[in-house]
Amino acid sequence: QESLSCDASGVCDGRSRSFTSIPSGLTAAMKSLDLSFNKITYIGHGDLRACANLQVLILKSSRINTIEGDAFYSLGSLEHLDLSDNHLSSLSSSWFGPLSSLKYLNLMGNPYQTLGVTSLFPNLTNLQTLRIGNVETFSEIRRIDFAGLTSLNELEIKALSLRNYQSQSLKSIRDIHHLTLHLSESAFLLEIFADILSSVRYLELRDTNLARFQFSPLPVDEVSSPMKKLAFRGSVLTDESFNELLKLLRYILELSEVEFDDCTLNGLGDFNPSESDVVSELGKVETVTIRRLHIPQFYLFYDLSTVYSLLEKVKRITVENSKVFLVPCSFSQHLKSLEFLDLSENLMVEEYLKNSACKGAWPSLQTLVLSQNHLRSMQKTGEILLTLKNLTSLDISRNTFHPMPDSCQWPEKMRFLNLSSTGIRVVKTCIPQTLEVLDVSNNNLDSFSLFLPRLQELYISRNKLKTLPDASLFPVLLVMKIRENAVSTFSKDQLGSFPKLETLEAGDNHFVCSCELLSFTMETPALAQILVDWPDSYLCDSPPRLHGHRLQDARPSVLECHQ
């Protein structure tokens, strides 16, 4: 049997050591003990007695099925306890009585059906994070379960086999910053929602089939809910259940952010938010994020005209990796307050983008992200976006563009352009001179000779440049990142010719450690202030004698350098 390895500060690692019991020889010097991925099965009353100063105890996936009632009695300093993914089929309040300093407790993934006969947590007055439940057996949440807990930063409940929720069980916790609820179906959702309305600031609902969700008015008095964010992850919705979910919004008037992540919509987008009060109650929602939305019949999807009015005040929309090929012109025109739009990883092409960015579309838009779509012509893309009078930032990275023409038109206020990973080989005057930030990293550029009088930041890493670009091209440059190119040297003159340069990242290039380069780096200790990745990323490529040495450490041969 292997032994623990401990460092000088008392952090002890015993992960995956084939321990079949808590190892002997534990001492008061130990501050942190990790015994995860062992086969411990049993913790006796004396096993941890010596660890009076232990602050962190991690026992996840160690096959523990029995813990004696007083096993943790000496752990009054313990702040972090992880018992997740063991074989504990019942939980005992006597374990937690002595743990008055505990801030983090993870009991998730054990095969218990309830949280125990009596309240587990009345003494845990410092608890900030609690994770409970499992996939298969945790079936009941009761009123006694959370007694004594008044405020939590994070509460995660995996109740994917829930059969009974006792009304008001979660109501006793007055303040929960982030509640994550794993529910397989919506049966108890309304009851739970009523109980957390006045306490939860961020509600995350996971893996819930909401297809049968039906709203009914909540038995609550006028409540001022602090909920700011609502997220659905891995959930299933229908057109009808979406309409029903919208009715919940009348109870959360401060909601500012809604997120759908990895959800399935078994519908056609035929939404009908029937009640006009729902529209006004969406008034404070500023951010809508949709990622990986799966719509089995996406090719029959509606134009969403029924929800236009819902989104008029929204400022930030992300719809990522969801097979979007068109935002209808009339929809774009309704998005009057939209300042940020991210349509990354979709199916947009110039022809449909033209319809989306029609006259009057997205009148307040400042940032547009069209990364990883199916755009091919930079010239057409720029021309199509001329309608966006307030656009300052455009990301069209990860599209495979045809070679760049000599001239292009772009929105006149554009200051930021991301052309990274677009396969470009040459930069031409198609790139607008108004730019302050340009990202052309991860392309096939072997030179850069474009005059950009306002450019403050240039990102040109992962290309094939052999030298730093000429400083006269960028009179006001502050930041240049040119890692992973083929730059062989830089000199005092080169760096000095960038009058305003504050940050240069030029590591992982093929440096030829010549006498000039090495003497320059030795004589210029201030390099560390400009080269943010100095010294570890600056290695000699040649001569062979110095290959792999850091420039900082490499010493030129006296013979070579004083000939």
Partner: nanobody
Framework: EVQLVESGGGLVQAGGSLRLSCAAS????????MGWFRQTPGKEREFVSV????????DYSSSVKGRFTISRDNAKNTVYLQMTSLEPEDTAVYYC???????????????WGQGTPVTVSS
């Protein structure tokens, strides 16, 4: 209607590996939650693992977590269970199931395969 057919079971030595497959026929495979369960003679069916519609969520029973990995290929209408570091206690008939709910409760699954036996010898 969904038909499920498991394969890949067999005899393996303790510490060895097996990969079970479950091929689904019928419509809308990608709309189903898929689960693996196992059963030994005289005992109730035991939850092993579950994967959601997209593959974005997975869960395991504590007895197999870290050793087994569930995955799915919606293009091939197939769900897999990669089993490593097998132990004699893993000996059972393994069943694949499809349902609408992401859960470890066997009664919430609508369709079941006929099972594939796994024997782990010491």
């Amino acid at each position: 209607e969904v038909q499920l057919v498991e394969s890949g079971g067999g005899l393996v030595q303790a510490g060895g590996s097996l990969r079970l497959s479950c091929a689904a026929s019928g419509r809308a495979f990608s709309s189903y939650v898929m689960g693996w369960f196992r059963q030994t003679p005289g005992k109730e069916r035991e939850f092993v693992s579950v994967i959601n519609w997209s593959g974005g969520s997975t869960d395991y029973s504590s007895s197999v977590k870290g050793r087994f990995t569930i995955s799915r290929d919606n293009a091939k209408n197939t769900v897999y269970l990669q089993m490593t570091s097998l132990e004699p206690e893993d000996t059972a008939v393994y069943y694949c199931a499809a349902g609408q709910y992401y859960t470890g409760r066997s009664d919430r699954y609508d369709y079941w395969g006929q099972g594939t036996p796994v024997t782990v010898s010491s």
